[in-house]
Interface confidence: low
């Protein structure tokens, strides 16, 4: 036998209180699939949490953050602070990197410079809070037509740059 | 590279105590060092943490006021005042797993093996 | 403050067995969540760090999975050597957090 409640589309519930009929959902609430019993709470997007996709019947509210703030989390589940390029969040707010480390971005840890010197090449141009070091070529790398600068090292996610 | 924590008595109540972690191996100013304690036969208990590169402090809420952590180039201190028999316990001190100030590297990956203080009249 | 809850207080199973290790945060720690393991008389020892990233030397048995505000340790293929308490530790200070306790409450893991 098949359920009634199967023929609810996304956007309704199967309203037990009324015989199995399928009911629009209320305000402020939403179901994205079929079917469903109740209709689940819309997300609010509140305090320092922007709406970037308003709540429908079958979709749920999506959030960004305010400008000075970026997301953290599964869907945006938290919003935290930026920092300038060449310092990084710490538990006392934003402070610069220190001697020797590069942030080049308004999120994640300051990272050390990279060190030309293990790879056998001299130092083109002198690191920054804010930038890495830039390594010319290996003294035997200078033939004509070959590139001058080495990139940057990749940026690494926070909690895992070297020691 | 390790850390060694020393200190740990016998004091009466009221007294004032001050732990010491000391370090070997590497330079405290780059890293968050914590306290942590652990009474007989009960979990851990964060007391607060410094980070050696600014010297900023940190502690849980009820230990604020009473309990006050500094450090020097390869100290870390906890001093400790007012003592109840509450306050019996291991102390631990612990060095962060990677250096620099960002709160993503505040997890523990070296630890002393503690010093016992007992509170008791 | 944010609160850190694990549950179970204690769980017994047997040797080749599974446990799972609940922690709960009182609200979202995105990622930033740890897991450590004690035995009696030794200092704590970092299992996994970043929700699921183990640290070198510690057993793929080990997983770690979660996010936001609820975290899994599960301990497969048991062995006698993992008898141990189990914490977990929440470390995201953004937006001004504040935790009375960083760890949890522990978890006894007694293998039979």
């Known amino acids: 036998l098949q359920d009634p409640c199967s023929n609810c589309p996304a956007g309704t519930f199967c309203d037990n209180n009324r015989n199995q009929i399928c009911s629009p959902c209320p305000p402020n609430s939403f179901s994205s699939a079929g079917g469903q019993r109740t209709c689940d709470i819309c997300r609010q997007c509140k305090g320092v949490f922007r709406t970037r996709k308003e709540c429908s019947s079958t979709s749920n509210a999506e959030c960004d953050c305010t400008p000075g703030f970026h997301c953290l989390g599964a869907g945006c589940s938290m919003c935290e602070q930026d920092c300038k390029q060449g310092q990084e969040l710490t538990k006392k707010g934003c402070k610069d990197c220190c001697f020797g480390t590069f942030n080049d971005q308004k999120r994640g840890i300051c990272r050390p410079w990279t060190n030309c010197s293990l790879a056998g090449k001299p130092v083109l141009m002198n690191g920054t809070k804010a930038r890495d070091v830039v390594c010319g070529p290996r003294p035997a790398d200078l033939s004509p037509g070959a590139s001058s600068v080495t990139p940057p090292a990749p940026a690494r996610e926070p909690g895992h740059s070297p020691q | 590279q390790s850390v060694e924590e020393s200190g740990g008595r016998l004091v009466t109540p009221g007294t004032p105590l001050t732990l010491t972690c000391t370090a070997s191996g590497f330079t405290i100013s780059s890293y968050h060092m914590i306290w942590v304690r652990q009474a007989p036969g009960e979990g851990l208990e964060w007391i607060g943490d410094?980070?050696?590169?600014?010297?900023t402090t940190d502690y849980a809420s009820w230990a604020k006021g009473r309990f006050t952590i500094s450090k020097t180039s390869t100290t870390v201190d906890l001093k400790m005042t007012s003592l109840t028999t509450e306050d019996t316990a291991t102390y631990f001190c612990?060095?962060?797993?990677?250096?620099?100030?960002?709160?993503?590297?505040?997890?523990?990956?070296?630890w002393g093996q503690g010093t016992l203080v007992t509170v008791s009249s | 403050d944010i609160v850190m809850t694990q549950t179970p207080a204690s769980v017994e199973a047997a040797v080749g067995g599974t446990v799972t290790i609940k922690c709960q945060a009182s609200q979202s720690i995105s990622s930033y969540l740890a897991w450590y393991q004690q035995k009696p008389g030794q200092p704590p020892k970092l299992l996994i760090y970043?929700?699921?990233t183990l640290e070198s030397g510690v057993p793929s048995r080990f997983k770690g999975s979660g996010s936001g505000t609820e975290f899994t340790l599960t301990i497969s293929d048991l062995e006698s050597a993992d008898a141990a308490t189990y914490y977990c530790?929440?470390?995201?200070?953004?937006?001004?957090?504040?935790?009375?306790?960083?760890f949890g409450g522990g978890t006894e893991v007694v293998v039979k």
């Open positions: 410094i980070y050696g590169g600014t010297a």
């Open positions: 970043r929700t699921s």
């Open positions: 530790q929440g470390y995201d200070w953004s937006s001004s957090n504040r935790y009375d306790n960083t």
């Open positions: 612990a060095r962060a797993r990677y250096s620099g100030g960002s709160y993503a590297n505040y997890v523990f990956n070296l």
